[in-house]
């Protein structure tokens, strides 16, 4: 738990933080990535099994900057963006260089973040204000979760063995806010 | 669920050290910047400073420097506040938060209560 | 040290009512101001950071604003738990500093 959801400026929801990797190496500066990678396991069995396991997604990576208030952070961090519909991890890296995509018969899968990683940031602010420093959670790795047909399209299961995690609030008093995904920076990034 | 469990009361006689222990559960202190308050009987807060567990950076409020001495222990999820040479002017309650910034403090301890006695 | 001056120290309200509570700055703290509640016998909680923004968890009738060296907690249709003292806090620069407290009553 821990990182449980964090509004920030632009009312977006981070769901709380399970475990998570070790800290990522140093961040490349002025350097944009976009990256595509396979995020599931290697496939052990044909891809008609319902194992959540034999699943993949995409994993981009960007960069971006962390605001807070009228800080910037002093460097950009790197984090990924889950993304595109599942299939067999067999499939994916050669779907996604052909262009090709396998669609399930059977009920939808989503991408949808797995791990977190916290990264403490240095923020910079305008008027001769000191550095300030914050901590950020980042998505680390991202998990395939079947879309039941028979809630409502928010309602995601997860076959992982990890199961998700609640989108509750912040620490001692759980409560979710409304989402809005997908924004250009990590405004106050929590 | 998360907490920040403080160690209990303490009695201590004037001129000795004491060390509050705050251990966190459910949420990892490496992830946060690890606060301390102080609030004395029937008067308001004063922030005493911070450290970030992760690397061990500390910063203290002028007043404590000398008094304040902040650690953590990632490996047991708990931070430190030692306080020296204690006056009376010691005896309060003192606070450890968990702030994801170092300028405001998100979830508190339930509080240790100092007594200094001469 | 920045001075964190609140008003007033002490108000009495009745259920329902909106109350609002103020605090000064001696200097510019931009928009770096929290609030915290310390309900009687307990420990103090954050109510909103960063002037106007609400701690998830916390219920709509509170609401912050303000900015520089003014800001303001409103509380809406006051409720029975809402009783407790507010401590303003700046976040601006060291040492950070709180109000001195606003003791909530009920009439």
């Known amino acids: 738990q821990g990182w449980q959801a964090f509004k920030n400026d632009a009312t977006e929801i981070i769901p709380e933080l399970g475990e998570y990797p070790e800290p990522p190496p140093e961040l490349e500066n002025n350097k944009t990535m976009n990256r595509a990678e396979n995020g599931g396991r290697p496939p052990h069995h044909p891809f008609e099994t319902k194992d959540v396991s034999e699943y993949s997604c995409r994993e981009l990576h960007f960069t971006r900057y962390v605001t807070d208030g009228p800080c910037r952070s002093a460097k950009p961090v790197t984090e990924l963006v889950c993304s595109g519909q599942c299939g067999p991890a067999r499939l994916l890296p050669n779907a996604i260089g052909r262009g090709k995509w396998w669609r399930p018969s059977g009920p939808d899968f989503r991408c949808i973040p797995d791990r977190y990683r916290a990264q403490r940031v240095q923020l910079l602010c305008p008027g001769g204000e000191a550095p300030r420093a914050r901590k950020v959670r980042l998505v680390a790795s991202c998990k395939c979760k079947r879309l039941t047909r028979f809630h409502n399209q928010s309602e995601l299961k997860d076959f992982g063995t990890e199961a998700a995690r609640p989108q509750k609030g912040r620490k001692p008093r759980p409560r979710a806010r409304s989402a809005k995904a997908n924004q250009a920076e990590l405004e106050n990034a929590y | 669920e998360v907490q920040l469990q403080q160690s209990g009361a303490e009695l201590v006689r004037s001129g000795a050290s004491v060390k509050l222990s705050c251990t966190a559960s459910g949420f990892n202190i490496k992830d946060y910047f690890m606060h301390w308050v102080k609030q004395r009987p029937e008067q308001g807060l004063e922030w005493i400073g911070w450290i970030d567990p992760e690397n061990g950076d500390t910063e203290y409020a002028p007043k404590f420097q000398g008094k304040a001495t902040m650690t953590a222990d990632t490996s047991s999820n708990t931070a430190y506040l030692q306080l020296s040479s204690l006056t009376s002017e010691d005896t309060a309650v003192y606070y450890c938060?968990?702030?994801?910034?170092?300028?405001?403090?998100?979830?508190w301890g339930q509080g240790t209560t100092v007594t200094v006695s001469s | 040290d920045i001075q964190m001056n609140q008003s007033p120290s002490s108000l009495s309200a009745s259920l329902g009512d909106t109350i609002t509570i103020t605090c000064h700055a001696t200097?510019?703290?931009?928009?770096?101001l929290s609030w915290y509640q310390q309900k009687p016998g307990n420990i103090p909680t954050l109510l909103i950071y960063k002037t106007s923004n609400l701690h998830t968890g916390v219920p709509s009738r509170f609401s912050g604003s303000g900015s520089g060296t003014g800001f303001t907690l409103t509380i809406s249709s006051l409720q029975s738990e809402d009783i407790a003292t507010y401590y303003c806090?700046?976040?601006?620069?060291?040492?950070?500093?709180f109000g001195g407290g606003t003791k909530l009553e009920l009439k």
């Open positions: 938060n968990a702030g994801q910034a170092t300028y405001y403090f998100d979830y």
């Open positions: 200097q510019n703290i931009n928009v770096w």
């Open positions: 806090q700046q976040g601006q620069s060291f040492p950070y500093t």
